[in-house]
Amino acid sequence: DGCKDIFMKNEILSASQPFAFNCTFPPITSGEVSVTWYKNSSKIPVSKIIQSRIHQDETWILFLPMEWGDSGVYQCVIKGRDSCHRIHVNLTVFEKHWCDTSIGGLPNLSDEYKQILHLGKDDSLTCHLHFPKSCVLGPIKWYKDCNEIKGERFTVLETRLLVSNVSAEDRGNYACQAILTHSGKQYEVLNGITVSITERAGYGGSVPKIIYPKNHSIEVQLGTTLIVDCNVTDTKDNTNLRCWRVNNTLVDDYYDESKRIREGVETHVSFREHNLYTVNITFLEVKMEDYGLPFMCHAGVSTAYIILQLPAPDFRAY
């Protein structure tokens, strides 16, 4: 069908609550484009009827709420005047009862669910709530070990919980809760956050921390387009460079002629006492020569790699 496939990272989500994912891919969605969502390679688009539990809302796919059976690969097709891209998003839904068990045992949790407070400082936690404009979010309540947080040192500021004079006792399992209103109906959103305490001044001293990748392999089909983010946390005043290298050479230099593999534009999100940086690497078309080669994300003195590998043959097809 002439659409270029792009594989995004997995999202691990909690059942029985709202979830939304925005189909944005800056090089493409910045212009005049149409966006259509599909599930599991279905030819039938996701409904745009706002009363549907799962529906498309502008560029978003919205689940009101998410259910256990919603796990799967969703595709959003971005069509421009002269281009077509199909972005694959793997959603995994789990049953999570925040008060029963620790969030710590879950695989691949994003940085949003693991946050750090700095001992002896004033710091904050952030409740990440990403929903389209049609969703109205009420005031956020915060919980620690399933008890609502109240006390002298805690103040709520929009999506943040301000914590004064952080102590070692502040580590643990937190949750932020908000009531989401959509088309007159109310839903509860509850995000779990595992909080650790660091004694180091600044955000981990001057050594940046690479959150992703984690020195692992990625299965990817030959000929596909692949985008991999490198997520780095570092101090706000850092002077570290972040980049992707292969064979100890900047990817933009290594693939200077073909431009088949490129480093993306760095973006960052500013937290109270650290920045979260993202710089991606784009494989426009994965070739045989890419397999088995470590693609290194560098951030100051820190490094982490990904290695592409061919998926194992699926014998069920025969």
């Epitope: 004064s164 706000k236 006492e273």
Partner: antibody
Framework: QVQLQESGPGLVAPSETLSLTCTVS????????VHWIRQFPGKGLEWIGV???????DFNAPFKSRVTISKDTSKNQVSFKLSSVTTDDTAVYYC?????????????WGQGTLVTVSS | EIVMTQSPATLSVSPGVRATLSCKAS??????VLWYQQKPGQAPRPLIY???YRHSGIPDRFSGSGSGTEFTLTISSLQSEDFAVYYC?????????FGQGTKLEIK
């Protein structure tokens, strides 16, 4: 000891920008946030906004489009600007700081500076 | 935003007598309430934080109580220097908000 002192013109014309400076001593702006509060002639107090130790800012919703807060850490100064003022902005303006171990309340205040908006 | 309502607006009391000031929050603020005292030409001065804890240097004739939505400041035996305006402030949730004040005047 911890001190904060506001300074700036006492008279501002309507539609102009009100500019104030808070000069601090006894602590570093890289360690503590500085808040701005105003008090109307009728005595009501209103929290306007804050510049955090990392330089980020937050504002009370009615002020988001009109207020700018910045700082020069080396000079121990915080700058406050309120644009498009009207006579309703006539008030005493305070800068303030929380206590070392306290929550979000103000243990230390400047002496305040009266700003009158009038043509 | 959370609205803080103080009563009465003015309280006329004789020196040596007990004074009780009230502050109500429009929603639950736990104990994140502070009382300030303000005299003419001066900045507010913190008296009681966390609803019932005296700030450093505050005489023990000042006491605070309450939680949730209802709070009280009590001055057990009024001294001449206590006649001033008193404000409550909540710091449970931004925007930080203040009561409109209670003026304590000599009867």
């Amino acid at each position: 000891q911890v001190q904060l002192q506001e300074s700036g013109p006492g008279l501002v014309a309507p539609s102009e920008t009100l500019s104030l400076t808070c000069t601090v001593s006894g602590f570093s702006l890289t360690d503590y946030a500085v808040h701005w509060i105003r008090q109307f002639p009728g005595k009501g107090l209103e929290w306007i906004g804050v510049i955090w130790s990392d330089g980020s800012t937050d504002f009370n919703a009615p002020f988001k489009s009109r207020v700018t807060i910045s700082k020069d850490t080396s000079k121990n100064q915080v700058s406050f600007k309120l644009s498009s003022v009207t006579t309703d902005d006539t008030a005493v303006y305070y800068c303030a700081r929380k206590g070392g171990y306290s929550g979000s309340w103000f243990a230390y205040w400047g002496q305040g500076t009266l700003v009158t908006v009038s043509s | 935003e959370i609205v803080m309502t103080q009563s009465p607006a003015t309280l006329s009391v004789s020196p040596g007598v007990r004074a009780t000031l009230s502050c109500k929050a429009s929603q639950d603020v736990g104990t994140n309430v502070l009382w300030y005292q303000q005299k003419p030409g001066q900045a507010p001065r913190p008296l009681i934080y966390s609803a019932s804890y005296r700030h450093s240097g505050i005489p023990d004739r000042f006491s605070g109580s309450g939680s949730g939505t209802e709070f009280t400041l009590t001055i057990s035996s009024l001294q001449s220097e206590d006649f001033a305006v008193y404000y409550c402030q909540q710091y449970s949730r931004y925007p930080l908000t203040f009561g409109q004040g209670t003026k304590l005047e000599i009867k």
